[in-house]
């Protein structure tokens, strides 16, 4: 028999422990939001919020303007300016709570902790490359708000996420804010809103339409927005709350709320519990049947996904997948699965699912005692009746009232538990060619570039690196710009590559002429690289023989 | 002194297009976004759309999308607004106004007009 | 759109008297209403802005007032060069609306 080289062990091909230095940025403070912009004219900027500040960066990371956004009663604030003359309210630090763009003329909005958490709107202004904001607009009208009605009270101190939507030449800003009693007390923000931005960004137009947590409910039920998205004719947004209103605060678990996008108001507000579950292959005695529920969503991401993965969800190519990275959960018991479970919700099920609800609660025969759900938000009641009536009306629709639908969404881990003791942080999901890569942040300050696929019972990545050797979190907001995504860990903000830092960490050139195209790997004498690094001979083809 | 000097009176074919302009002068441009307003013979005003002067940003009255296109030029000062596709419904008068797109502004300097007839 | 319903389409009215322009919009537009005068062959110019804000430059004997939908704009002593046509427009939603005007003559 021919002798053969012995093979290298895959563990072996490659090296986590490569150093590479991406472009960074300290922001000053611990970075609290980010948003980026890329204009039509090729300006772009990265917008990085810390307390009482807001940095305006270019797409190399290098500061191009700062300004001040509290603390609101000091005269160097130069957001609480634009309110004119005070005093406003109480003095005390901006958290930036919120930063979104309006995309119509285009502008930035920052919303923050401090001066009843209302908006603030920065015309955009292009300087060659570069993006400065104008002075900013007070989006607040002393004359209607009031404190048991505020249309332009936006933000909660403990959290607010926001989806903009242009509906007509209109911009409407749905927010979904965590509430307590507390909060609720103070300049009444709601739990879920759809507001208008008037067109002379004056403020936001009265009488919006709105849910919120009931004041019964306010001091056990309180509900974590995760993230919202926009896709199609829906706005989502993803929660973590109680699994019930009796038993709160109790086991958590995740929904996912669907509101339109067409129409700004709630009658056809929908939730669906999202279920996500570790299902190893061979399972162990006494595991669960089904297998082991992971009820929480630490972060979520949507985007298109690859031809590969699309095959594997049975998804046409190019569909819209909700991405979730789910953990155990505080009362979980002795975990012997992964820190952390990635599950992959096709959007297209998720709005077949949530109308089969519908048509469940609302078209006869209807099951009886079934609940149309969402207590803390309205009245109980039974299907068809509206919320607080114990029998349909007949001038009513069962259809234009708030529902939870009565099945979940149901999902497995698309990495089979191989995550392991990562502890996911972040997550952002983009289509390379034919491939679908994960880009995670973790809790210990590294990223992790890895291809979904779920048939693989080893992890395909593109790169696993620290960002530095603070090792601090890498944080929930994640940007794109171009080729590139920006992470934030502590007070900094990190560019990094789509296609992956480098690839130096893949160590033999079999790996090396085996890594996905995208990322541009070729041999290079002794080492796997980018045809740029290499000045000598450089091949993605071929292996020279081994000795 | 604010001005907003626009361009001279124009009669035009059916079916072909024009460009006014509209120069600035006297006032920080680029801090203010600039709306075209018709006013047909004897009738009232009717906002055709605005243009953000800083980044371009533009917001239509539907009714005027496909017939008016508004554009900036920061280094001479100047909004411009391309009328397509003339007919004889487009026979008015068209001012540019500024306005500060923010709460307690409204449209503070008009521009003198231009009157524009079509006719064959 | 928002419509701007002003009435009267035609004031007659003799030099020092008081008089109102009423303006009424389809829904509530809050305080985000201006009001404009037009002379024969002349540009618009703003009056008041935000319902009841004077402009500087504007004579004191113009004033506004009103929120919500139903808003008045006043002249308390009319001079003969109040001659003109006055328009109320909103700025509360897009597309931005004017009304269909007052022509205010003297007797």
């Known amino acids: 028999k021919e002798w053969q080289c012995p093979r290298t062990p895959y563990a072996a091909s490659r090296d986590f422990n490569v150093k590479y230095m991406v472009p960074s940025f300290s922001a000053g403070g611990l970075v609290q939001t980010m948003v980026t912009y890329q204009g039509d004219k090729n300006e772009s900027a990265v917008f990085v919020a810390i307390r009482n500040r807001l940095h305006v960066l270019g797409p190399d990371l290098k500061s191009v303007q700062s300004l001040a956004t509290g603390p609101a009663g000091d005269p160097g604030c130069q957001t609480c300016a634009a309110c004119g003359p005070g005093p406003h309210g109480p003095s005390g630090d901006t958290d930036t709570k919120v930063l979104v763009l309006e995309p119509a003329l285009p502008a930035l909005v920052s919303c923050g902790s401090s001066l009843q958490g209302r908006c603030f709107l920065h015309d955009l202004d292009p300087q060659g490359t570069a993006v400065h904001l104008a002075a900013p607009a007070c989006l607040f009208s002393a004359h209607h708000n009031r404190p048991d009605d505020c249309p332009d009270c936006v933000a909660s101190p403990l959290g607010t996420r926001v989806t903009v939507v242009e509906q007509g030449q209109a911009s409407y800003f749905y927010v979904a804010s965590s509430l307590d009693a507390a909060v609720a007390a103070s300049f009444s923000p709601r739990s879920v809103s759809i507001r208008r931005l008037k067109a002379d960004a004056s403020g936001f137009a009265p009488g919006f339409v709105a849910l919120s947590v009931l004041p019964k409910h306010l001091v056990s039920y309180s509900i974590e927005y995760v993230h919202s998205f926009h896709t199609g004719a829906f706005v989502y947004f993803l929660t973590v709350q109680p699994a019930s209103v009796t038993d709160a605060p109790g086991a958590l678990h995740t929904r996912l709320a669907r509101l339109s996008a067409t129409e700004p108001e709630l009658g056809d507000y929908r939730e669906l519990v999202l279920d996500c579950r570790f299902a190893p292959k061979r399972r162990r005695r006494g595991a669960p049947e089904g297998g082991q529920p992971y009820p929480v969503l630490r972060v979520a991401h949507s985007a298109p996904v690859g031809a590969q993965l699309a095959t594997e969800l049975s998804i046409a190519e190019g569909q819209e997948v909700l991405f979730g990275v789910f953990v155990a959960g505080k009362d979980s018991g002795p975990g012997v699965g992964p820190n952390s479970v990635v599950c992959a919700f096709p959007i297209d099920l998720l709005d077949t699912l949530i109308d089969e609800g519908v048509e469940r609660c609302c078209e006869s025969p209807v099951h009886p005692g079934l609940r149309r759900g969402l207590d803390f938000f309205q009245s109980p009641s039974f299907c068809p009746n509206p919320p607080g009536l114990e029998a349909p009306s007949p001038n009513t629709s069962c259809r234009h009232f708030p529902l939870l639908v009565s099945s979940s969404f149901s999902r497995v881990d698309l990495f089979n538990g191989l995550l392991g003791t990562v502890e996911v942080t972040a997550l952002y999901v983009t289509r390379l060619d034919n491939v679908t890569v994960a880009h995670m942040g973790t809790a210990d300050g590294r990223i992790l570039q890895v291809e979904l696929a779920r048939s693989l019972n080893y992890l395909l990545y593109v790169s696993n690196f620290s960002l530095g050797d603070s090792g601090q979190p890498v944080q929930r907001d994640v940007s794109r710009l171009g080729d590139h995504l920006f992470f934030a860990s502590g007070d900094q903000v990190f560019q990094v590559p789509i296609q992956g830092p480098g690839c130096r960490h893949f160590l033999t050139c079999g790996r090396c002429l085996r890594a996905q195209r995208f990322m541009g790997c070729g041999w290079c004498g002794n080492m796997c690289g980018r045809q740029k690094e290499c000045p000598g001979s450089w091949q993605q083809d071929h292996c020279p023989p081994k000795l | 002194e604010v001005q907003l000097q626009q361009s001279g009176p124009e009669l035009v074919k059916p079916g072909a297009s024009m460009k006014i302009s509209c120069r600035a002068a006297?006032?920080?441009?680029?801090?203010?976004?600039m709306n075209w307003v018709k006013q047909s013979h004897g009738k009232s005003l009717e906002w055709i759309g605005l243009i953000n002067l800083n980044n371009g940003g533009t917001s239509h009255n539907q009714k005027f999308k496909g017939k008016a296109t508004l554009t900036v030029d920061k280094s001479s000062s100047t909004a411009y607004m391309e009328l397509l596709s003339l007919t004889s419904e487009d026979s008015a008068v068209y001012y540019c106004a500024r306005w500060l797109r923010r709460g307690g502004y409204a449209m503070d300097y008009w521009g003198q007009g231009i009157s524009v007839t079509v006719s064959s | 759109d928002i419509l701007l319903t002003q009435s009267p389409a035609i004031l007659s009215v003799s030099p020092g008297e008081r008089v109102s322009f009423s303006c009424r919009a389809s829904q509530n537009i809050g305080t985000s209403i201006h009001w404009y005068q037009q002379r024969t062959n002349g540009s618009p110019r703003l009056l008041i802005k935000y319902a009841s804000e004077s402009i500087s430059g504007i004579p004191s004997r113009f004033s506004g007032s009103g929120s919500g939908t139903d808003f008045t704009l006043s002249i308390n002593s009319v001079e003969s060069e109040d001659i003109a046509d006055y328009y109320c427009?909103?700025?509360?939603?897009?597309?931005?609306?004017f009304g269909a005007g007052t022509k205010l003559e003297l007797k």
């Open positions: 427009q909103q700025s509360d939603s897009w597309p931005l609306t």
């Open positions: 006297g006032f920080s441009f680029t801090g203010y976004t």
